[in-house]
Amino acid sequence: PEPPTACREKQYLINSQCCSLCQPGQKLVSDCTEFTETECLPCGESEFLDTWNRETHCHQHKYCDPNLGLRVQQKGTSETDTICTCEEGWHCTSEACESCVLHRSCSPGFGVKQIATGVSDTICEPCPVGFFSNVSSAFEKCHPWTSCETKDLVVQQAGTNKTDVVCGPQDRLRA
């Protein structure tokens, strides 16, 4: 028969012969022969390969460096890489999560629209009319101004995006 020029899925062509690729979690140690299948070996303790492959070396698992604020979110296996995330109060600087930065705080006049996660920073929004924030915080939303009317009080000092209204007693009618 004619030697093959292309091979099936999960095979590779070598020396006019189709050999099986190694399954995820294993590396190539010797091509198939006319008598035997491909020889593959499991990846070592801290290594992985996540595809059908003919790699001769497994990849090292990612190291979640605590000095960079990283911790392990999901331990790697022979078929998957380790997934890192950031310590509490920090978030990844990139999709690959190679280092972390402190979550930003929303300044006075801004409230938290979305609390930060291990992979995304805090999202702030300006406090709209009727709301305020007087602190720098990574958690606090804009608070509504106090409603003086519901307390049978009147506004003595108007609120801003950074301050609440000041309520006071209503002026008494003079006799």
Partner: antibody, heavy 110, light 111 residues
Framework: LEESGGRLVTPGTPLTLTCTVS????????MNWVRQAPGKGLEWIGY?????SAGYASWAKGRFTISKTSTTVDLKISSPTTEDTATYFC?????????WGPGTLVTVSS | AQVLTQTPSPVSAPVGGTVTINCQSS????????LAWYQQKPGQPPKLLIY???KLASGVPSRFKGSGSGTQFTLTISGVQCDDAATYYC???????????FGGGTEVVVK
Amino acid sequence: LEESGGRLVTPGTPLTLTCTVSGFDLSSNAMNWVRQAPGKGLEWIGYITISGSAGYASWAKGRFTISKTSTTVDLKISSPTTEDTATYFCARGYNTMAIWGPGTLVTVSS
Amino acid sequence: AQVLTQTPSPVSAPVGGTVTINCQSSQNVLINNRLAWYQQKPGQPPKLLIYDASKLASGVPSRFKGSGSGTQFTLTISGVQCDDAATYYCQAGYSSGDGNAFGGGTEVVVK
């Protein structure tokens, strides 16, 4: 596979055996050296991996060195003794020795 | 170092009979299945029969059968033929630091 370099040597004379390969690539195949003393069983000496790192039987460490080029695999016997008299085979594979050469005879005698 | 013990030796069988050769490893073989069987006739290199404990090498007659896992393995030759007279070796692969090892061999005599 074809082994060469086997001959009569005196004890202590270094000797290098060569296995010449054709029809496959050493960059994606491991190779083993195995020997067989006259009338005795098979004895694994060592292998060389795809990456070029060698592994040896515990008794063979320090006495034998395996190395390779793109088409040959060498076995160096640093200081042969009469106990090293044997037919030496090279075989293709890592844990499974699928294809063997015919062997080359080494005789160590004074 | 690992030791592979083959039993019995020698073994004889009539034509058409069955031969069973055992191979015991002093430690688990790699992935529990990295064990091969070879046939050797005088003046020839060994020939691979079985690999990964039970896979038949291409071109080898189906009367040869391998079984076992971990430390205990068996080669069975059913319907023995005159041509099967030879010495049979088991060979195991171990984790990378320990490499490979051969059993002592079993001579099969066909009567």
